[in-house]
């Protein structure tokens, strides 16, 4: 089969429940901080719903940083069952986005941000420092990323990776357009390409979850992440099978098996296929 033939495989699974975080800091992005140390740490990735490794610079950063995988899991995951991950930009908002602002019972009066379901915007409030609820973010950006809608009512996605046309470099971006794809495969297929920390220039392939294709990149020889394959075939094998295309009303969907093209209609998360 050519790459085109195996590009869009329909896979159905039960949908994950809305993400319920144990602590609001579990929703923070990994922050390596401004320092230059190379320290292996772990953070909770709200999109893959897993604790993942990152390199911490040794100072500042945020609270979504743990010395061990176990500590991360303990703090940020309610159960450690290995479920199939389904990531989509039309995911429901987490339940806590709809909670009212709650300053808690203490008197620290720290500036925090909460999602106001009346105004549909993230707003500043004064947090006392203890208790409260999870509609409580350290930065406006974190609040927007988790709770606000992007254009067209789609939720903001933090982990889009786009190819920069100017210098051909890989740029993780905050993609605010609706994705055409849904992903049901291994979580690392959703991570951006990561050159790593060394100085080699090895030819590798990574799965670009925005465009749904395996693309080449230069690997430094050490570090990086698991979205790193020695061949395009290996990349496709690992990541393509969990990938389906999301299309607007009446569009076409391809499947791996060479059948006639089928009309599909997508309503929110559901795919209705006629004449199967």
């Amino acid at each position: 089969d050519s790459e085109e033939d195996e590009e869009h495989t329909i896979i159905t699974d039960t949908e994950l429940p809305p993400l319920k975080l144990m602590h609001s800091f579990c929703a923070f992005k990994a922050d390596d901080g401004p320092c230059k140390a190379i320290m292996k740490r772990f953070f909770f990735n709200i999109f893959t719903r897993q604790c993942e490794e990152f390199i911490y610079g040794g100072c500042e950063g945020n609270q979504n940083r743990f010395e061990s995988l176990e500590e991360c899991k303990k703090m940020c995951t309610r159960d450690n069952a290995n479920r199939i991950i389904k990531t989509t930009l039309q995911q429901e908002k987490p339940d806590f986005c709809f909670l009212e602002e709650d300053p808690g019972i203490c008197r620290g009066y720290i500036t925090r941000y909460f999602y106001n379901n009346q105004t549909k915007q993230c707003e500043r409030f004064k947090y006392g420092g203890c208790l409260g609820n999870m509609n409580n973010f350290e930065t406006l950006e974190e609040c927007k990323n988790i709770c606000e809608d992007g254009p067209n009512g789609f939720q903001v996605d933090n982990y889009g990776t786009q190819l920069n046309a100017v210098n051909n470099s890989l740029t993780p971006q905050s993609t605010k357009v609706p994705s055409l794809f849904e992903f049901h495969g291994p979580s690392w297929c959703l991570t951006p390409a990561d050159r790593g920390l060394c100085r080699a220039n090895e030819n590798r392939f990574y799965y670009n979850s925005v465009i749904g294709k395996c693309r080449p990149f230069k690997y430094s020889g050490c570090g990086g992440n698991e979205n790193n394959f020695t061949s395009k075939q290996e990349c496709l094998r690992a990541c393509k099978k969990g990938f389906i295309q999301r299309i607007s009303k009446g569009g076409l969907i391809k499947t791996k098996r060479k059948r006639k093209k089928q009309r599909v209609k997508i309503a929110y998360e559901e795919i209705f296929v006629k004449n199967m």
Epitope: F25, Q63, R65, D102, G104, I105, G108, G129, C130
Partner: antibody, heavy 117, light 109 residues
């Protein structure tokens, strides 16, 4: 002087209910958040529940969520803890404490709750 | 659940200084300047000894002092006296819980 006095403890069967009270005096009760803290025999302290000064928000430890209800009557300077579906592991001395910004600066003498068949 | 870790016991002779440590995770103790310490004699209610890491309530001896570095808080008692023999608990909080350490039994030899 500033004082907290708990009452309502006793022996109850598993699955049973009990209501604890805490009478406050000597300070402006409606200006403080209040908490319940418990201590199982020979064990350490465990936070149970908290309530804001005006009663508008309540908070619970995971171990009691859905079973215990904290409330207050500011006109009577009294804090309550309604305990339902009691279990053997709820056996403890229950203290009410005044919460001053995350720490507990005034404590009652405690009331013993024993859950046993 | 989140926990604050204390040594089960420490001991010292009268007049000596001892330090009790309390180690937390980045989300609780390390994230706020909110560590407090309580003294509890057998059969009695706890008593607040230190709040906001190093502040002493009125009536508490200046032999008691508190500090914090990173995710570890410490209670130091200088000039140990027989009446200091008791259980000591550290306490902090986060978004979901008000948390106590497991307690440290101080024995004055």
């Amino acid at each position: 002087q500033v004082q907290l006095v708990e009452s309502g403890g006793g022996l109850v069967q598993p699955g049973g209910s009990l209501r604890l009270s805490c009478a406050a005096s000597g300070f402006t009760f409606n200006s403080y958040a209040m908490t319940w803290v418990r201590q199982a025999p020979g064990k350490g302290l465990e936070w149970v529940s908290a309530i804001k000064s005006d009663g508008s928000n309540t908070y619970y430890a995971d171990s009691v969520k859905g079973r215990f209800t904290i409330s207050r009557d500011n006109s009577k300077n009294t804090l309550y803890l309604q305990m339902n579906s009691l279990r053997a592991e709820d056996t403890a001395v229950y203290y009410c404490a005044r919460n001053d910004s995350g720490w507990f600066d005034v404590w009652g003498q405690g009331t013993l709750v024993t859950v046993s068949s | 659940d989140i926990a604050l870790t204390q040594p089960a016991s420490v001991s010292g002779s009268p007049g000596q200084s001892i330090t009790i440590s309390c180690t937390g995770t980045s989300s609780d103790l390390g994230g706020f300047n909110t560590v407090s310490w309580y003294q509890q004699h057998p059969g009695k209610a706890p008593k607040l000894m230190i709040y906001s890491v190093s502040s002493r309530p009125s009536g508490v001896s200046n032999r008691f002092s508190g500090s914090k570095s990173g995710n570890t808080a410490s209670l130091t008692i200088s000039g140990l006296q027989a009446e200091d023999e008791a259980d000591y608990y550290c306490q902090s909080y986060d978004l979901n819980n008000l948390v106590f350490g497991g307690g440290t039994k101080l024995t004055v030899l």
